[in-house]
Amino acid sequence: MMTGTIETTGNISAEKGGSIILQCHLSSTTAQVTQVNWEQQDQLLAICNADLGWHISPSFKDRVAPGPGLGLTLQSLTVNDTGEYFCIYHTYPDGTYTGRIFLEVLESSVAEHGARFQIP
């Protein structure tokens, strides 16, 4: 039975040109994490394999950095980065756990309306 739960950074609103960290944390299970995939819509961004370490998809190499931990750092954000991001934890023996994060990248003029917020 799958008892684990995924906690995420929560949805994030960021400004164009900035950088953000996406993180997920798997808790309430003793299952072993064999691999974590980070995906955006249907695109694979990065893989962190327990044995082989990190692999960043070639098309994202310039703007995606591994970590901290099993998280992912996105840099030089563009409005085009707006969308849903998935952390997919492959575990043994439980199977697959998935977390979802919505990232909203705003033009500076739009972001100013939320000036009282910490905008990454």
Epitope: T9, N11, V79, N80, T82, H113, G114, F117
Partner: antibody, heavy 118, light 112 residues
Framework: EVQLQQSGPELVKPGASMKISCKAS????????MNWVKQSHGKNLEWIGL????????SYNQKFKGKATLTVDKSSNTAYMDLLSLTSEDSAVYYC???????????WGQGTLVTVSA | DVVVTQTPLSLPVSFGDQVSISCRSS???????????LSWYLHKPGQSPQLLIY???NRFSGVPDRFSGSGSGTDFTLKISTIKPEDLGLYYC?????????FGAGTKLELK
């Protein structure tokens, strides 16, 4: 002035599908996500999902996956929601709303009443 | 999904009263950057919902200062200091920190 103009009320038969439109004016359409909200029984509000007009990226409430499909036409500043295989449970008022995570849903369409009945 | 519990569901008032509506979430609404995406709406019959408060405590443009929001983490409150006739209707809170976004069940503000 920000305006979201939705298509008119619809009476549809069970099993049919339909499309609701939401025409935006008074702001830069690609700069804001468009959200869709369902209001049933005159009270409950449910978030269906959102679409980012800039790149077409979507995020759905899993409850509405397979029921609603969100699209945009940037050339006409219009967001669309397709509702599929309608049943009486889908009878409701549907709203499009412009928002950001920061400011919430600041502007709303007037709502589209959908009645599913044989 | 994050469950948003709104209380009370019904709130009988007289004009001039001060009232509070509570909104509690099943997990913290602060994201990893310390931002909390919690907003409040008023829905009057025959109209579309209107934004009152965003980011816990920021009044949307044109919203009278008799409306105020407060709270943190999982516990949030909307206060209306002096009830006027145009304040009657359904009040909802919405959390935007976690997917899917979720609304409270609504609080009906009605005359005693």
């Amino acid at each position: 002035e920000v305006q979201l103009q939705q298509s008119g009320p619809e009476l549809v038969k069970p099993g049919a599908s339909m499309k609701i439109s939401c025409k935006a004016s008074g702001f830069s359409f690609p700069g804001y996500t468009m959200n869709w909200v369902k209001q049933s029984h005159g009270k409950n509000l449910e978030w269906i999902g959102l679409i980012n007009p800039y790149n077409g990226a979507t995020s759905y409430n899993q409850k509405f996956k397979g029921k609603a499909t969100l699209t945009v036409d940037k050339s006409s500043n219009t967001a669309y929601m397709d509702l599929l295989s309608l049943t009486s449970e889908d009878s409701a008022v549907y709203y499009c709303t412009r928002g950001t995570l920061i400011t919430g849903f600041a502007y709303w369409g007037q709502g589209t009443l959908v009645t599913v009945s044989a | 999904d994050v469950v948003v519990t709104q209380t009370p569901l019904s709130l009988p008032v007289s004009f001039g009263d001060q009232v509070s509506i509570s909104c509690r979430s099943s997990q913290s609404l602060a994201n990893s950057y310390g931002n909390t995406y919690l907003s409040w709406y008023l829905h009057k019959p025959g109209q579309s919902p209107q934004l009152l408060i965003y980011g816990i405590s920021n009044r949307f443009s044109g919203v009278p200062d008799r409306f105020s929001g407060s709270g943190s983490g999982t516990d949030f409150t909307l206060k209306i200091s002096t009830i006027k006739p145009e304040d009657l209707g359904l009040y909802y809170c919405l959390q935007g920190t976690h997917l899917p976004l979720t609304f409270g069940a609504g609080t009906k503000l009605e005359l005693k």
